[in-house]
């Protein structure tokens, strides 16, 4: 796969993943009422990171925000923080990667600068994806713990009426947002890895600039430091490079000059 394609695909995959992270963070269905083996309630409860909602049998849905910071579980706060950090890093990653894209020309930015930016954005996407995956996993773990705790005391005594009064223990299970978050985090991570791989292809080879052209009578022969390995192609750089009179310039360099195909 060419460097440009790898970089472009990495960017697109990261972008999709990033959009998914935002969607998951905003979604209300992080946890949904478990309907299996439960008293059948005429209401359906579900909760997000920012508010809890109830859908009645008529379809009427009412949501209430968590208007407190101190009263919320530390784990929920941690998940919120992880998701926000993931989004912030993703935004920075996108901005950096836009400038790093090989198909976009900005001033006289050389390939080494683009390579560094590509690597930076790749790392940002990787961390962003990891933040999302950790955040979602922490929430999922919290749900599993609470689920088994509430199953253990499905009905808790409420006193009154001779101690016979029962309260319905609403058990919660994984909501759609968790799956969106896991997939989105994974995509962002994969996209970041692709950007890092693309960075390697973008990095200019130092030997290209150390090459010297000698004009022998009758023919053009390129001599490179490194002896036999350089000419036989068994060295570290096995790609076929053309050497031109105008100095050492690779095929990749040739592409970096605007052609009529560069502007899409």
């Amino acid at each position: 796969m060419s460097v440009t394609a790898c970089q472009g695909l990495g960017f697109v995959v990261s972008l999709i993943g990033f959009a998914g992270i935002i969607a998951a963070t905003c979604m209300d269905q992080w946890s949904t009422q478990d309907l299996y083996n439960n008293p059948v309630t005429a209401v359906f409860n579900y909760q997000g990171l920012w508010r809890s909602c109830v859908r009645e049998s008529s379809g009427f849905t009412e949501c209430r925000g968590y208007f407190t910071l101190l009263g919320l579980p530390a784990m929920l706060q941690a998940v919120r923080a992880l998701m926000i950090v993931g989004i912030v890093l993703g935004v920075i990653g996108i901005l950096v990667s836009i400038f790093a894209l090989k198909c976009i020309r900005i001033g006289s930015m050389d390939d080494s600068a683009k390579a560094k930016m590509t690597l930076t954005s790749g790392i940002l996407f990787i961390i962003s994806g990891i933040c999302a995956i950790i955040g979602v996993s922490v929430f999922a773990n919290m749900l599993v713990t609470n689920f088994w705790m509430s199953t253990a005391n499905m009905y808790s005594g409420m006193g009154g009426m001779g101690g016979m009064v029962q309260t319905v223990q609403t058990r919660y299970t994984f909501g759609a947002a968790l799956f969106v978050g896991w997939v989105a985090g994974g995509l962002t991570l994969i996209g970041g890895v692709m950007m890092c791989i693309a960075c390697r292809g973008l990095t200019p080879d130092d030997s290209n600039f150390k090459a010297v052209s000698y004009h022998a009578s009758g023919q053009n022969v390129a001599y490179r430091p490194g002896g036999f390995k350089a000419s036989t192609g068994f060295g570290s750089n096995t790609r076929n490079k053309k050497i031109y009179d105008g100095g050492a310039r690779t095929e990749d360099d040739e592409q970096s000059h605007p052609t009529k195909y560069d502007y899409v």
């Epitope: 309630t41 009645e56 049998s57 008529s58 379809g59 009412e62 209430r64 409420m158 009064v165 319905v168």
Partner: antibody
Framework: VVQLVESGGDFVQPGGSRKLSCAVS????????MHWVRQAPEKGLEWVAY????????YYADTVKGRFTVSRDNPKNSLFLHMTSLRSEDTAMYYC????????????WGQGTPLTVSS | DIVMTQSPSSLTVTAGEKVTMSCKSS????????????LTWYQQKPGQPPKLLIY???TRESGVPDRFTGSGSGTGFTLTISSVQAEDLAFYYC?????????FGLGTKLELR
Amino acid sequence: VVQLVESGGDFVQPGGSRKLSCAVSGFTFSSFGMHWVRQAPEKGLEWVAYISSGTTNIYYADTVKGRFTVSRDNPKNSLFLHMTSLRSEDTAMYYCVRSGYYGNSLDYWGQGTPLTVSS
Amino acid sequence: DIVMTQSPSSLTVTAGEKVTMSCKSSQSLFNSGNQRNYLTWYQQKPGQPPKLLIYWASTRESGVPDRFTGSGSGTGFTLTISSVQAEDLAFYYCQNVYIYPLTFGLGTKLELR
């Protein structure tokens, strides 16, 4: 004006079957869940069955489970209650009721259709 | 199933008097998700179908006079008529609308002295 008109109530022998109908008008029938509620002579109200707007959720009272079937025909604005293995204790006034938009309330009630199960 | 217990079974009052009737459920009807109680009150006059009075334990249905007030939470609920009128003579039923099967109380009969 919301209107619910029940029909089909009659004298039935124990063990017999009957199908009650409810013709609805004045609101978008397909958007609302519907209930059947009955009231035995000189007795209180007893909830019988519920069917959601899209028929995905159907619930019955334990006393009628396995004997009664609730259904609806949204294009025809009609609600049905098919009753089998009828018993004398099923004798009651049967009401067709709309499920309210708020609070799972039962907001509009028909006038009812009487069913008598007797030999 | 949730058992709804209404008391008293009948009340004899004079016009203008304040009336209170009780409804208790065997399980809590409070939903923590939206902080609401899923209890409904109905009024049934002789020869008529029931009429919705109050939902969410305390929210009056539109068109219901403000002399009718619902209160309570969890398992204990109350319907209060601040000043009874002749047209208020009827049966009053409370209903669990939280857990299926939805269950009614046996009712409270309001009579004029």
